[in-house]
């Protein structure tokens, strides 16, 4: 580019940047500064389309700079400018005030409660290592290989054992600090702990002393036994376990005071450690007396096993329990150790899984509950601890006794299986705020049905409707039972049904809700202000 051209360009820029220097009296009223090849001033182009237009243009030639400044300084225009400026700032301040008011008056985000790890999902009990792993495998090293499976269930904790040395009914030959060599070594246990931690699975150790004997607590030498438990708590906490379980506490004399002492040791080590107590009792008063002096104790009992499998009775049991326990964290199971199938017919397993995962508290399952493991279907297997059915080869005793749909392998491949339902529910339970710590409101839905809402603040809400009966039912959802904060919408989206055949994700009209026999529905709907 030549030097001349550069100068030309600068002139163009000056002319564009200082328009007041352009003459405003060009005939067309539109003078243009053009950079030509020569530096010969301005090129004026007169565009006259007709005589009338030219005449009009000649009448008004615009104001000169001096005239413009003179008019702009007149009192009228000054007042107008000030008024507009004032209007602008008032508008701006008004919007600011409006925003502040909206923010202040908008409902506060509810403060999240303190969440312990056992609040965030299910616990999985493996009371019998050998039965869980199957033929010839039952040890800690073998269990380590099953941790991926537990991860796939999205359970938060593994309740293991007891695995300590226990000679039946012999206090002196029971050592809570030693692992029974049949199960492995302390090194195997440490290795299991490390692997479990990497997979975010907590390990809870069962320290029920006389687990091979007639009376879990020996019913003797309670001072010696209690000291052994106390020493074991301290030892295993140092070893890195996340909590403890003791069962059959209805048979431990002065259980409340011992539990309080053991709880102090556990919580004294870390607030993040858990103590679970198990009882065979189903009596609410007995259960409450055990809970009374023990904050943060998780108690598993046979309370719900008395439900008689009717909607009304189950609703009554659940609401009584929640009312009686107030704001303490609950756990939900049908017993302290046994499988769901020892209490429930096969057709109610899905319904109970849905209920246990959606009630407020920690659901606790035994190994095999996720596949509907049933000792009665396996000849010669003990009711308390039947062999886990990993695949069809898991029970070779009677060829053909186990079909693919009874096994982990078979059910993993079937999206409509009990195992698939368990995994989906476990996933929802661990990530949805309303299910994690939401409020609970049960309400009437008609005879035979149990229905409730789980909601937390402005998060997505969940409606659960359970038909315990063996006939189809229409749900008459009585929203009048509900507080204003938990009102029902006209429609809710179907997240899942325990029965096949419904289109998931489709909106269902709540006034026209019909449930199949033994069907449970999990519906979701958004918060509406």
């Amino acid at each position: 580019m030549s030097q001349d051209t550069e100068v030309d360009m600068k002139e163009v820029e000056l002319n564009e940047l200082e328009p007041e220097k352009q003459p405003m009296n060009a005939a067309s009223g539109a003078a243009m500064s053009l950079a030509g090849a020569e530096k010969n001033g301005l090129v004026k182009i007169k565009v006259a389309e007709d005589e009338a237009e030219a005449a009009a243009a000649a009448k008004f030639t615009g104001l000169s700079k001096e005239e413009l400044l003179k008019v702009a300084g007149s009192p009228g225009w000054v007042r107008t400018r000030w008024a507009l400026l004032l209007l602008f700032w008032l508008g701006w301040l008004g919007m600011l005030a409006g925003a502040v008011v909206i923010i202040v008056r908008a409902p506060r985000c509810r403060e999240l409660p303190a969440q312990k790890w056992w609040h965030t999902g299910a616990l999985y009990r493996i009371g019998d290592l050998q039965a869980f792993q199957g033929h010839g495998a039952g040890n800690l090293a073998g269990l380590k290989g099953r941790l991926d499976y537990l991860s796939s269930l999205k359970v938060k904790g593994l309740v293991l054992g007891p695995i300590h040395k226990n000679q039946k009914d012999d206090v002196a030959q029971t050592d809570l600090l030693q692992i029974d060599p049949n199960f492995g070594s302390k090194e195997d246990f440490d290795s299991l702990l490390q692997s479990a931690k990497k997979k975010s699975i907590r390990v809870i150790l069962d320290l029920t002393p006389n687990y091979r004997g007639e009376n879990s607590w020996f019913s003797t030498q309670v001072d010696t036994v209690a000291t052994k438990v106390k020493d074991a708590l301290e030892f295993w906490l140092q070893a890195g376990v996340d909590g403890f379980q003791v069962r059959d506490i209805e048979n431990l004399k002065d259980a409340s005071s011992f539990l309080a002492e053991w709880q102090n040791i556990t919580k004294g080590f870390s607030e993040d450690r858990l103590l679970i107590a198990g009882t065979n009792s189903s009596d609410l008063q007995q259960i409450l007396s055990l809970l009374e002096s023990n904050k943060d104790l998780l108690l598993t009992s046979s309370y719900l096993s008395d439900s008689g499998s009717t909607g009304e009775h189950t609703k009554s049991l659940v609401t009584q329990y929640l009312n009686a326990t107030g704001n303490r964290w609950c756990s939900w199971s049908l017993s302290q150790a046994r499988l769901l199938t020892s209490f429930l017919p096969a057709q109610l397993l899905r319904l109970y899984q849905l209920m246990l995962f959606t009630l407020p508290g920690t659901p606790v399952f035994s190994y095999g509950d996720e596949i509907g493991l049933d000792a009665a279907a396996l000849p010669g297997q003990p009711m308390e601890a039947p062999v886990m059915l990993w695949d069809e080869s898991s029970f070779p005793d009677i060829p053909g006794a186990v079909s693919a749909n009874m096994t982990v392998k078979g059910q993993s491949e079937d999206p409509g299986s009990l195992l698939s339902l368990f995994r989906r529910l476990s996933d929802q339970r661990s990530k949805e705020r309303s299910l994690l710590h939401g409020d609970f409101h049960a309400f009437s839905a008609g005879p035979g049905l149990f229905s409730y809402i789980r909601h937390w603040d402005q998060n997505e809400r969940f409606l659960v409707v359970l038909n315990f009966g063996d006939v189809g039912l229409s749900a008459g959802l009585q929203a009048s039972d509900l507080p204003a904060s938990a009102s029902l919408p006209a429609k809710a989206d179907l997240l899942l049904s325990t029965q096949p055949g419904r289109e998931e994700g489709s909106p269902l009209e709540l006034e026209r809700l019909k449930l199949e026999p033994h069907e449970g529905l999990l519906l979701r709907f958004p918060y509406a202000a």
Epitope: N215, S219, T220, V222, D223, K253, E261
Partner: antibody, heavy 117, light 107 residues
């Protein structure tokens, strides 16, 4: 070998006081609940009092008939359990045994307390 | 308070015969029951605790059974050295209570 040895018994007038001691050996005293049990021809064997461990805040329990009059205590450093008896009555007469554990797996030979004018 | 009742104050049994002594609690004691043997001039000796657990050094002819409120001490074949008074005791809840005792004699 586990040994329990009671002492302090004797004759005392009604309304009087007496303190019984029981020295233990052969086991970890501080980890054991300790009891006092008495025996008389009229009442047979009768449990009197129990004291638990330091970790139980040395919790104590008493038979209704001695509540407010008798006090059980322990000194773990001396492996000794005591029974302080006040306002004694004729019906408190008997052989007083100390026993270890729950139930009494080990007993002393007993010390005779006679309450008489 | 839980009352303990031993139905027989005296039992007279021939040597070598089976002996059964019963004890009934007024309330459930969850197997927290002990059996003691006392010979004249001696302190009581613990035979069985936890309703069924035989103490070390106690002959195997002694056995305990029962649950809930009803408990039994059995001697399969009575020996001369078994002549004594037998007491049951509940230690489930304070105040701990003893039965009135059963005096065993040779017929």
């Amino acid at each position: 070998e586990v040994k329990l040895e009671e002492s302090g018994g004797g004759l005392v007038q009604p309304g009087g006081s007496m303190i019984l001691s029981c020295v233990a050996s052969g086991f970890t005293f501080s980890n054991s609940w300790m009891n006092w049990v008495r025996q008389s021809p009229e009442k047979g064997l009768e449990w009197v009092a129990e004291i638990r461990l330091r970790s139980n805040n040395y919790a104590t329990h008493y038979a209704e008939s001695v509540k407010g009059r008798f006090t059980i205590s322990r000194d773990d450093s001396k492996s000794t359990v005591y029974l302080q008896m006040n306002n004694l009555r004729a019906e408190d007469t008997g052989i007083y045994y100390c026993s270890r554990g729950d139930p009494g797996a080990y007993w002393g030979q007993g010390t005779l307390v006679t309450v008489s004018a | 308070d839980i009352q303990m009742t031993q139905s027989s104050s005296y039992l007279s049994v021939s040597l070598g015969n089976r002996v059964t002594i019963t004890c009934k609690a007024s309330d459930h004691i969850k197997n927290w029951l002990a059996w003691f043997q006392q010979k004249p001039g001696n302190a009581p000796r613990l035979l069985i605790s936890g309703a069924t657990i035989l103490e070390t050094g106690v002959p195997s002819r002694f056995s305990g059974s029962g649950s809930g409120k009803d408990y039994t001490l059995s001697i399969t074949s009575l020996q001369t050295e078994d002549v004594a008074t037998y007491y049951c005791q509940q230690y489930w809840s304070t105040p701990y209570t003893f039965g009135g005792g059963t005096k065993l004699e040779i017929k």
